[in-house]
Amino acid sequence: FVRTKIDTTENLLNTEVHSSPAQRWSMQVPPEVSAEAGDAAVLPCTFTHPHRHYDGPLTAIWRAGEPYAGPQVFRCAAARGSELCQTALSLHGRFRLLGNPRRNDLSLRVERLALADDRRYFCRVEFAGDVHDRYESRHGVRLHVTAAPRIVNISVLPSPAHAFRALCTAEGEPPPALAWSGPALGNSLAAVRSPREGHGHLVTAELPALTHDGRYTCTAANSLGRSEASVYLFRFHGASGAST
């Protein structure tokens, strides 16, 4: 299920291909599209242009991150008079043009979404031949990828003075709340580190001092679900080592 949020500044228009030419280039994209990790999403993009009945060569491009400078994730080219836009680039084979650029539609389908796909995307069209012109969306469309929590790492590490601490790292969107439970802990939120720079979907919770042997469970939960993982601490009494 894909939700598309549309605001008044860039409303989606269906542009009739043979209408009189527009005054200027314009691109219509929604501010945001939301979809769940693992699913597919459609990034809508339609445009108007000032060139009457253009049927020369064209290239459709989508890039991620920022306009102009961001890396291309999809590119296709259509020959003069052709309605077929031949794919030249589809990053990891997951991007596919749904729209028909000849009918002013550059809408893109993204398959098998991952949290790393959560970023802004910019559509661009280039005309070549007699008319040489190009245009790229200025604000782009934000692809918001949601995901149920997944614990990516749980571990026990030595601390100074023969103590031990536990770390739990989980990913999800919205970022999950983490809680530790274990011997003499009850249910503890522990010390939760805010998402790290460049790792916006990762959250880490630390149990700074494990005082009892036994099973420690980390639970990650957000509005889409929960996940848990456990780690066991068993210290050899009288020795400085521990088994986990």
Epitope: T8, N11, Q23, R24, S26, P50, H132, Y135
Partner: antibody, heavy 118, light 115 residues
């Protein structure tokens, strides 16, 4: 911080030519159109023309056609405006402007004053 | 012919609102325009792109006190909670490709005085 740094003020005699430069930093001029706009003392803005540095294609306002040349050097990220057969009415502040593809002129240089006087 | 008409001046008190009008020539009443601000002794600054339906997209660093609206051939720029730094000329501009010829026209500008 996007910057368009223009060359300094010029004083020219009628009939002469002037060449004004505009150096861009923090962005690649190949990705934009570069426009030139002028403003005579106490007057409004007047569009002169633009260049697409990607392929050096230019568009000029009919009023300036034949008297103006806009060029760009992508290796130095610099745009140039050359205006020939100067007359006193060409006395103005000349602005180079970054043009988003399409029509929006979203970033303006500081301006270069050109004075034409005998 | 593509023409933009603006009234020469407007004034309002500090903290009040002012609404500026830019009128397109009748045969171009559907056109999208751009608004620019020019403070005294400075170069122009891009304020917003304003469409026929009133939707608008503001430039970087433009406060949300600046808004746009449209009615027929008229395009409006409203500045609310007027500040002293808003004292400037406000110029509308319109770019179009007409019969494969690119043109860009500016209005005469409206001088806003903050009382």
């Amino acid at each position: 911080q996007v910057q368009l740094v223009q060359s300094g003020a010029e004083v020219k005699k009628p009939g002469a030519s002037v060449k004004v430069s505009c150096k861009a930093s923090v962005f690649n001029i190949k990705d934009y159109y570069m426009h030139w706009v002028r403003q005579a003392p106490g007057q409004g803005l007047e569009w002169i023309g633009r260049i697409d540095p990607e392929d050096d294609k230019t568009k000029y306002a009919p009023k300036f056609q034949g008297r103006v040349t806009i060029t760009a050097d992508t290796s130095t990220s610099t745009a140039y405006l050359e205006l020939s057969s100067l007359r006193s009415e060409d006395t103005a502040v000349y602005y180079c402007v970054r043009g988003w593809l399409g029509y929006i002129m979203d970033f303006w240089g500081q301006g270069t004053t050109v004075t034409v006087s005998s | 012919q593509l023409v933009l008409t603006q009234s020469p001046s407007a004034s309002a008190s500090l903290g009040a609102s002012v609404k500026l009008t830019c009128t397109l020539s009748s045969q171009h009443s559907t056109y999208t325009i751009d608004w620019y601000q020019q403070q005294p002794e400075k170069g122009p600054r891009y304020v917003m792109e304003l469409k026929e339906d009133g939707s608008h997209s503001t430039g970087d660093g433009i406060p949300d006190r600046f808004s746009g609206s449209s009615s027929g051939a008229e395009r409006y720029l409203t500045i609310s909670s007027l500040q002293s730094e808003d004292e400037a000329d406000y110029i509308c501009g319109v770019g179009a490709t007409i019969k494969e010829q690119f043109v860009y026209v500016f209005g005469g500008g409206t001088k806003v005085t903050v009382l």
